[in-house]
């Protein structure tokens, strides 16, 4: 297993609709054809997997149907979008990149993007 540098923004504020997008960029030492991207969330000392996708270079990322993540790739960059976020989902979202094929296997883990989520203010009741 060889180490690889992964860069991601330090801080992002999700939209009022609970959507946060950020780029995860990795310094690929070689010509990988198969890449696996995993998003981890760290909050209150616990790390949980948010979503993961394996893709072939030049192809779209495919997350599971029920995943809250979507993404696109371009060269050594992965543009990740996480949807359905609420204030309680605020936390440090860490991008993990693995170059699966061809060998050698490379692993890179970013420093994390602190995603802040603000629940929208409830609309005042209106009488009609």
């Amino acid at each position: 297993c060889k180490a690889m540098h992964v860069a991601q923004p330090a801080v992002v504020l999700a939209s009022s609709r609970g959507i946060a997008s950020f780029v995860c960029e990795y310094a690929s030492p070689g010509k990988a054809t198969e890449v696996r991207v995993t998003v981890l969330r760290q909050a209150d000392s616990q790390v949980t997997e948010v979503c993961a996708a394996t893709y072939m270079m030049g192809n779209e990322l495919t997350f599971l149907d029920d995943s809250i993540c979507t993404g696109t790739s371009s060269g050594n960059q992965v543009n990740l979008t996480i949807q359905g976020l609420r204030a309680m989902d605020t936390g440090l979202y860490i991008c993990k990149v693995e170059l699966m094929y061809p060998p050698p296997y490379y692993l890179g883990i970013g420093n994390g993007t602190q995603i802040y989520v603000i629940d929208p203010e409830p609309c005042p009741d209106s009488d009609f």
Partner: antibody, heavy 118, light 108 residues
Framework: QVQLVQSGAEVKKPGASVKVSCKAS????????ISWVRQAPGQGLEWMGW????????NYAQKLQGRVTMTTDTSTSTAYMELRSLRSDDTAVYYC???????????WGQGTKVTVSS | EIVLTQSPGTLSLSPGERATLSCRAS???????LAWYQQKPGQAPRLLIY???SRATGIPDRFSGSGSGTDFTLTISRLEPEDFAVYYC?????????FGPGTKVDIK
């Protein structure tokens, strides 16, 4: 080195607007957020809101909602805070600070004194 | 919104003494994202402690932070003349970010 440099002092009349700038240098501007904090004479620190330089999304303190607008110009690595309908109790020193996520507000501007007086 | 309460309001001590400042949150601070800042007259605040207990770059080791959840403490083990200032706690675990009212440490 990493620093935030703010615009100079302002004197405004009640009802007017003020726009304070905060120029960042020494780091990748879009990777972080910029928060604005003010301090009235002899008082504590009051958080006003913040902007994510990465995507331009904003979150304002409830009491200032509708009067404050925070923006960024990524081409010049500058953040702006505009406060409208100024009142005498808006007289304060206004600070910008870099938000780093886990590492808090690590870098602060030198402050901009705004005086609202008729 | 999380409300922070600091105590005492003023702490009168002599150089060389130990200072213990308290900060209490109205609800648990996410990931213990609590910071302490020092402010001297006419100056911008300076970050001392982040993540409740980690010292910021260049901060002397006489400053230490502790606590978790809703109760946090800043300790200055031996006060130096330059430590007399106002100290603010701040939570940045969830937005809106909030500051405590401050504790003034002055010379007895």
């Amino acid at each position: 080195q990493v620093q935030l440099v703010q615009s100079g002092a302002e004197v405004k009349k009640p009802g007017a607007s003020v726009k304070v700038s905060c120029k960042a240098s020494g780091y990748t501007f879009t990777s972080y957020g910029i928060s604005w904090v003010r301090q009235a004479p002899g008082q504590g620190l009051e958080w006003m809101g913040w902007i994510s330089a990465y995507n331009g999304n904003t979150n304002y303190a409830q009491k200032l909602q509708g009067r404050v607008t925070m923006t960024t110009d990524t081409s010049t690595s500058t953040a702006y805070m505009e406060l409208r309908s100024l009142r005498s109790d808006d007289t304060a020193v206004y600070y910008c600070a870099r938000i780093t996520g886990p590492y808090a507000f690590d870098i602060w501007g030198q402050g901009t004194k705004v005086t609202v007086s008729s | 919104e999380i409300v922070l309460t600091q105590s005492p309001g003023t702490l009168s001590l002599s150089p060389g003494e130990r200072a213990t400042l308290s900060c209490r949150a109205s609800q648990s601070v996410s990931s213990n994202y609590l910071a302490w800042y020092q402010q001297k007259p006419g100056q911008a605040p300076r970050l001392l402690i982040y993540g409740a207990s980690s010292r910021a770059t260049g901060i002397p080791d006489r400053f230490s932070g502790s606590g978790s959840g809703t109760d946090f403490t800043l300790t200055i083990s031996r006060l130096e003349p330059e430590d007399f200032a106002v100290y603010y706690c701040q939570q940045y675990g969830s937005s809106p970010f909030t500051f405590g009212p401050g504790t003034k440490v002055d010379i007895k």
